[in-house]
C-alpha cells in the first residue's frame, strides 16, 4: 500500500524513557491499523512509450494491481471518457475488443493488463499535451481510473524505451512482500491491542506541525470496504520527455483536477485526507477509487454522491481470463 498514513502527535503521559516507549507503542498501532484497513487497495498503472522508429506511434500500457477479476477496460484520450474524452478502445475479457482510430492495435497482455498501439500524425500526435485515461472495472473492487497528460515537448531519442520488468516486479512485490508485511503487522497489531486492552490510553492531540495536515481518524475494519478515496501513484515510464515527471497534485496536475471534490461525501475518511495529501512525485498518473460492487440488484450501504468525473458504479460482473480479440 503506497498511501502515506499521517499519525497524530501523541501527548506522552510523562517524560523519560517510559513516556518515549509509550509514545512509540501507541503510534505503531495507528500505523498498523491504517495498513491493515487499507491493505489490498487496488490501483491502476499507466505506461506511455513513444516508439523510437515511428515518432508518431505510441504504445499505451495499463494494468490493474488488485486481486479482483477484471470485467471491462476502456482507454480514452483527451480526458476521462464522458468528460470531453474520446474512447480509443474497449476491452472485454470474454467478448473481445473494439478499438477506434487512431488506435491501431489493442490487446490483452495479461489477465490484468492491456496494451494499445496508437498512431498519430501532425497536430493529432498524442505528444501534444494529450491526456490518456484507463478505466478498469473489477469484481469486487469496483471501478478504477488512472489519467495523465503527456508532456508537450520531448525528444524520444534521449531515452531508451521502458521495459515492463519494473511493473512486473511491483506486482510481485505487492503480492508477496506487502502481503507478508501486512500479515505480520496485523498479527502484531492484535498482540499490541491485547497488551494495551486494560491500560488507559493517553489523550490524542492533533499535530501542530502543519496547519494543513489532516487529522488521523480510526475507522472500523467493517467500513474498510467502503473506505475513503485513496490517491496512490502509479509508475509511468515515458520517453516523450525523459528524466522528468510531473508531480500529480490537486494544484499542479492535469487541469481536470479542478473538478475533483475536496472531500468524499458519506465515505469515512482514512488517516490521510486525500484532497490535501501530496502525491509522491514518481508519476503524474493517479489511481482513483470509483466505487465498489454490491451484490446483484443491491446498493452498497453508502449511497452518497460519487466523484464528479468518476461516477459511482455498483454491480457485479466476475469474468475469467482474457480470450483476445474476436
Amino acid at each position: 500500500m503506497r498511501t502515506e498514513a499521517q499519525v497524530p502527535a501523541l501527548q506522552p503521559p510523562e517524560p523519560g524513557l517510559e513516556g518515549a516507549m509509550g509514545h512509540r507503542t501507541l503510534v505503531l498501532p495507528w500505523v498498523l491499523l491504517t495498513l491493515c484497513v487499507t491493505a489490498g487497495t487496488p490501483e491502476v498503472w499507466v505506461q506511455v512509450r513513444m516508439e523510437a522508429t515511428e515518432l508518431s506511434s505510441f504504445t499505451i500500457r495499463c494494468g490493474f494491481l488488485g486481486s479482483g477479476s477484471i470485467s471491462l477496460v476502456t482507454v480514452s484520450w483527451g480526458g476521462p471518457n464522458g468528460a470531453g474524452g474520446t474512447t480509443l478502445a474497449v476491452l472485454h475479457p470474454e467478448r473481445g475488443i473494439r478499438q477506434w482510430a487512431p488506435a491501431r492495435q489493442a490487446r490483452w497482455e495479461t489477465q490484468s493488463s492491456i496494451s494499445l498501439i496508437l498512431e498519430g500524425s501532425g497536430a493529432s500526435s498524442p505528444c501534444a499535451n494529450t491526456t490518456f485515461c484507463c478505466k478498469f472495472a473489477s469484481f469486487p473492487e469496483g471501478s478504477w481510473e488512472a489519467c495523465g497528460s503527456l508532456p508537450p515537448s520531448s525528444d524520444p531519442g534521449l531515452s531508451a524505451p521502458p521495459t515492463p520488468a519494473p511493473i512486473l516486479r511491483a506486482d510481485l512485490a505487492g503480492i508477496l512482500g506487502v502481503s507478508g508485511v501486512l500479515l505480520f503487522g496485523c498479527v502484531y497489531l492484535l498482540h499490541l491491542l491485547r497488551r494495551h486492552k486494560h491500560r488507559p490510553a493517553p489523550r490524542l492531540q492533533p499535530s501542530r506541525t502543519s496547519p494543513q495536515a489532516p487529522r488521523a481518524r480510526a475507522w472500523a475494519p467493517s467500513q474498510a470496504s467502503q473506505a475513503a478515496l485513496h490517491v496512490p501513484y502509479a509508475t509511468i515510464n515515458t520517453s516523450c520527455r525523459p528524466a522528468t515527471l510531473d508531480t500529480a497534485h490537486p494544484h499542479g496536475g492535469p487541469s481536470w483536477w479542478a473538478s475533483l471534490p475536496t472531500h468524499a461525501a458519506h465515505r469515512p475518511q482514512g488517516p490521510a485526507a486525500w484532497a490535501s495529501t501530496p502525491i509522491p512525485a514518481r508519476g503524474s498518473f493517479v489511481s482513483v477509487e470509483n466505487g465498489l460492487y454490491a451484490q446483484a440488484g443491491e446498493r452498497p450501504p453508502h449511497t452518497g454522491p460519487g466523484l464528479t468525473l468518476f461516477p459511482d458504479p455498483r454491480g457485479p460482473r466476475a469474468m475469467e481470463g482474457p480470450l483476445g480479440v474476436r
Epitope: 476502456t74 468528460a83 472485454h92 473494439r98 477506434w100 472495472a137 470509483n290 458504479p313 454491480g315
Partner: antibody
C-alpha cells in the same frame, strides 16, 4: 436471455423534456453497454448515444450533444435517456439496445420501444 | 459526421439470392467499422442479424450471412423466404465509439 423493458408512451409539449427508462432483466447489467436509438415516423434508425453502466460515462452522437443525457442506475438495472428542449421533429419511437454476446458497445438485444409525441 | 449509404429498395424472388450493401462516405468499410445488420418489420423493434461483419446470433437464420465486399459491408440472403420481407439497416462504428445507421433498404420478396 436478457430482456429490455421500456417505459410507456409519452406526450410532451415543445420545449419540455422527456425521460425514458429501460429496465434490464435476465442477465448482468454493469459492464454491458446500453445504446439509445430513435426512429421518427416513416424514417430510418438514428443512434443517439450509449453508456457503460459500470463506468457511468456516456458518449453521444454529435447531433444530440448537449440535449441528451444518458444515465444508468445499477441498483435497479435501469438505463435512462433524457431529451430536453423537445421539438416536434423529436416525435419518434425511442429504443434502447444492449450488447449480449458481441464485443463491447454492441447492440444485440432491443427493447420494445417507447413512443414520444411532441405536440403543442 | 459520416454518411452511411444503402440501396433504398431491392426485390428478390422466393428462393432467390440477394445482396444488400452498406458503404461509408469516409472511404472503404473495414472490419474496424464493426458492421451490424438489423431486420425490422412494420410495427416491431429492430432485430439484430449480424454483428462484427459476419457473426450471427443464435436466432439468425442460416440463410443470412455478412461479409465485406468491394469496400462495403454486405448482407447476403440466400434462399429468400416471404417472411424475410422487411427493412434492413446497417450500422457502422466510427472514432470515439460513435455509431451511424444507414438509411435502410426495403426488401421485397415477390
Amino acid at each position: 436471455q436478457m430482456q429490455l423493458v421500456q417505459s410507456g408512451a409519452e406526450v410532451k409539449k415543445p420545449g419540455s423534456s422527456v425521460k425514458v427508462s429501460c429496465k434490464a432483466s435476465g442477465g448482468t447489467f454493469s459492464s454491458y453497454a446500453i445504446s439509445w436509438v430513435r426512429q421518427a415516423p416513416g424514417q430510418g434508425l438514428e443512434w443517439m448515444g450509449g453508456i457503460i453502466p459500470i463506468f457511468g460515462t456516456a458518449n453521444y452522437a454529435q447531433k444530440f450533444q448537449g440535449r441528451v443525457t444518458i444515465t444508468a442506475d445499477e441498483s435497479t438495472s435501469t438505463a435512462y435517456m433524457e431529451l430536453s428542449s423537445l421539438r416536434s421533429e423529436d416525435t419518434a419511437v425511442y429504443y434502447c439496445a444492449r450488447e449480449e454476446v458481441s464485443s463491447p458497445y454492441g447492440m444485440d438485444v432491443w427493447g420494445q420501444g417507447t413512443t414520444v409525441t411532441v405536440s403543442s | 459526421q459520416a454518411v452511411v449509404t444503402q440501396e433504398p429498395s431491392l426485390t428478390v424472388s422466393p428462393g432467390g439470392t440477394v445482396t444488400l450493401t452498406c458503404g461509408t462516405s469516409t472511404g472503404a468499410v473495414t472490419s474496424g467499422h464493426y458492421p451490424y445488420w438489423f431486420q425490422q418489420k412494420p410495427g416491431q423493434a429492430p432485430k439484430t442479424l449480424i454483428y462484427d461483419t459476419g457473426n450471427k446470433h443464435s436466432w439468425t437464420p442460416a440463410r443470412f450471412s455478412g461479409s465485406l465486399l468491394g469496400g462495403k459491408a454486405a448482407l447476403t440472403l440466400s434462399g429468400a423466404q416471404p417472411e424475410d420481407e422487411a427493412d434492413y439497416y446497417c450500422l457502422l462504428s466510427y472514432s470515439g465509439a460513435s455509431w451511424v445507421f444507414g438509411g435502410g433498404t426495403k426488401l421485397t420478396v415477390l
